[in-house]
């Protein structure tokens, strides 16, 4: 029906007020709902009005705004502090205390989190996103800095349907349609060997409790398990010779263990240093990525910390130690 | 196969010392925690130790601080109990237990060994 | 130090009943609490971790449930191999420690 310059939708009806002509719903069933597109964000319940723009949000806190898109700090939280002496005491001993696992801890001081103190130092949403690993999608967490709310944005519930099939013939040189999908790691970019490399900028370094024969050996599954939590492909650098960058790597006792053998004499052979694992150095190639998702790293900082992060969820299913993310080509060290 | 091996239980005089130690096989040693936890005849469990090989790091209850030390050589794949200044009531069933969750002494302890028996008594 | 209380201490079921162990915790530990069984002369064995997952190999009739400071370990339907001993367990924090357990008898 005709409102003057309002043109009201199907169901609705032309009302004359003090402050000019309204439209109006007599009957919600028969008008278009304002709820069929979901307004209302961040968990807030949408109820069905008579009046534009139809629907009204009820916010969980600390949302509100008309369709709690605005967020709004408690007014009198202090800022969480890690007042225990026992995280004191235990951080950055290499173990990780879930008691002292919270972002007021550091993560234990990086005990839990791969070395790294402070995964979201780059996310500047208003929300504490490392408290929003909810299996919910938080829009103001679903940002690269913020490491994609950890893919809760888009449909993150996805297996990999013939998961067994698909891990054993995974970068096989192969390509097998059924495991080429985001979900399935893209078979390894197996179908896409035609296709152009896609580098992010960097290299991810990467400590693993694994002796480099074993970590070599086992080098598709690895790949695999990191890549599905990146939600991108993932490989081993070749140095200039063309040899895979994966060494040795001997170690770092905690300081507690230093100075214990500080003071006592070595004993006969404990000079001769131990191979505690291997130190790989992995490159994103996101060809497949960016043809499927909007949400691929351009560079290796946010992988790094998106790591750390699943580290601090405990979610990582190989025993890495840390986790750098290397602007630069790196010199060989140790 | 994960396996775990204890050995070196006995009979000790009050005051006196034994090390135990737990043989491990079937994994990658130093990646994983390793707890010592006894159980005195007839009692429940207690938890006395815990050691993350890779880092060194050891954790002790009360009851046995600063007369206990628990160590761990990864190029023999073994870790061990130092018990000095022994007591009546540390008589029990010593087991060593793997940690489930590599670097978090805050996951369960998922392969026990079989036990080794520690009586203290004059 | 967190404090695990178990009850009952000890029960008498037949085969075929469903059984419900409870252990209380003096301070939260959020889901960090796991169960296990001993039986006589033999080291114990996980059944459940993180309050409700299965250790590989235990059967679907033991279940866990619970979070904070209450938890349950539940037999659905008793068979003959599960009478033993049941520890609950926190690994919130150190020192980790046990609940005094549970004896599962025969009626």
């Known amino acids: 029906s005709s409102c003057g310059q309002v043109k009201c939708r199907k169901g609705e009806q032309c009302v004359h007020t003090a402050s000019g002509p309204r439209c109006f719903c007599p009957s919600p069933r028969d008008c278009e709902s304002g709820c069929a597109s979901s307004p209302c964000q961040h968990g807030g319940s949408c109820h069905p009005q008579r009046q534009p723009p139809y629907y009204s949000c009820q916010c969980a806190p600390p949302f509100s705004g008309s369709r709690c898109e605005l967020y709004t700090a408690p007014p009198s939280t202090p800022p969480a502090t890690c007042l225990s002496q026992y995280c004191a005491d235990k951080a950055r001993d290499g173990v990780c205390d879930e008691a002292c696992n919270s972002h007021a801890c550091q993560w234990d001081g990086g005990d839990c989190s791969l070395t790294m103190e402070n995964p979201w130092a780059n996310c500047s949403s208003p929300l504490p996103c490392w408290d929003y690993i909810n299996n919910q999608c938080d829009e103001l967490c679903n940002t690269v800095e913020c490491l994609f709310d950890n893919f809760e944005c888009q449909g993150n519930s996805k297996t990999c349907k013939y998961d067994k099939y698909c891990a054993d013939h995974f970068k096989d040189n192969h390509c097998d349609q059924g495991c080429n999908s985001e979900e399935c790691g893209w078979d390894g970019l197996d179908c896409a060997a035609d296709q152009p490399e896609n580098l992010a900028e960097g290299t991810l370094v990467i400590v693993v409790l694994m002796p480099p024969e074993q970590l070599l050996q086992d080098a598709r599954s690895f790949l695999r398990a990191l890549g599905t939590l990146l939600h991108t492909n993932l490989r081993i650098k070749r140095d200039s010779q063309g040899e895979l960058m994966v060494y040795p790597y001997y170690g770092e006792k905690s300081a507690a263990m230093k100075k214990q053998r500080m003071t006592r004499r070595s004993l006969p052979g404990e000079q001769e240093q131990e191979v505690a694992g291997s130190k790989v150095f992995l490159e994103i190639d996101n060809r497949q990525c960016v043809q499927d998702s909007d949400h691929c790293f351009k560079n290796t900082d946010a992988a790094a910390a998106l790591l750390a992060s699943h580290a601090i969820q405990g979610t990582l299913s190989y025993p890495l130690v840390s986790v750098v993310s290397e602007s630069l080509t790196p010199e060989r060290t140790q | 196969e994960v396996q775990l091996v204890e050995s070196g239980g006995g009979l000790v005089q009050p005051g006196g010392s034994l090390r135990l130690s737990c043989a491990a096989s079937?994994?990658?040693?130093?990646?994983?925690?390793m707890s010592w936890v006894r159980q005195a005849p007839g009692k429940g469990l207690e938890w006395v130790s815990y050691i993350y090989p890779y880092s060194g790091a050891t954790y002790y209850a009360d009851s046995v601080k600063g007369r206990f030390t628990i160590s761990a050589d990864t190029s023999k794949n073994t870790a061990y109990l130092q018990m000095n200044s022994l007591r009546a009531e540390d008589t029990a069933v010593y087991y060593c237990a793997r940690h489930s969750g590599y670097y978090r002494i805050s996951s369960a302890m998922d392969v026990w060994g079989q036990g080794t028996l520690v009586t203290v008594s004059s | 130090d967190i404090q695990m209380t178990q009850s009952p201490s000890s029960l008498s079921a037949s085969v075929g009943d469903r059984v419900t162990i409870t252990c209380r915790a003096s301070q939260s530990n959020r889901r960090f609490l796991a169960w296990y069984q001993q039986k006589p002369g033999k080291a114990p064995k996980l059944l459940i971790y993180g309050a409700s997952s299965r250790a590989s190999g235990v059967p679907s009739r033991f279940s866990g449930s619970g979070s904070g400071t209450d938890f349950t370990l539940t037999i659905s339907s008793l068979q003959p191999e599960d009478f033993a001993t049941y520890y609950c367990?926190?690994?919130?924090?150190?020192?980790?420690?046990f609940g005094q357990g549970t004896k599962v008898e025969i009626k």
């Open positions: 079937g994994y990658t040693f130093s990646s994983y925690g």
């Open positions: 367990q926190q690994y919130y924090i150190s020192p980790l420690t």
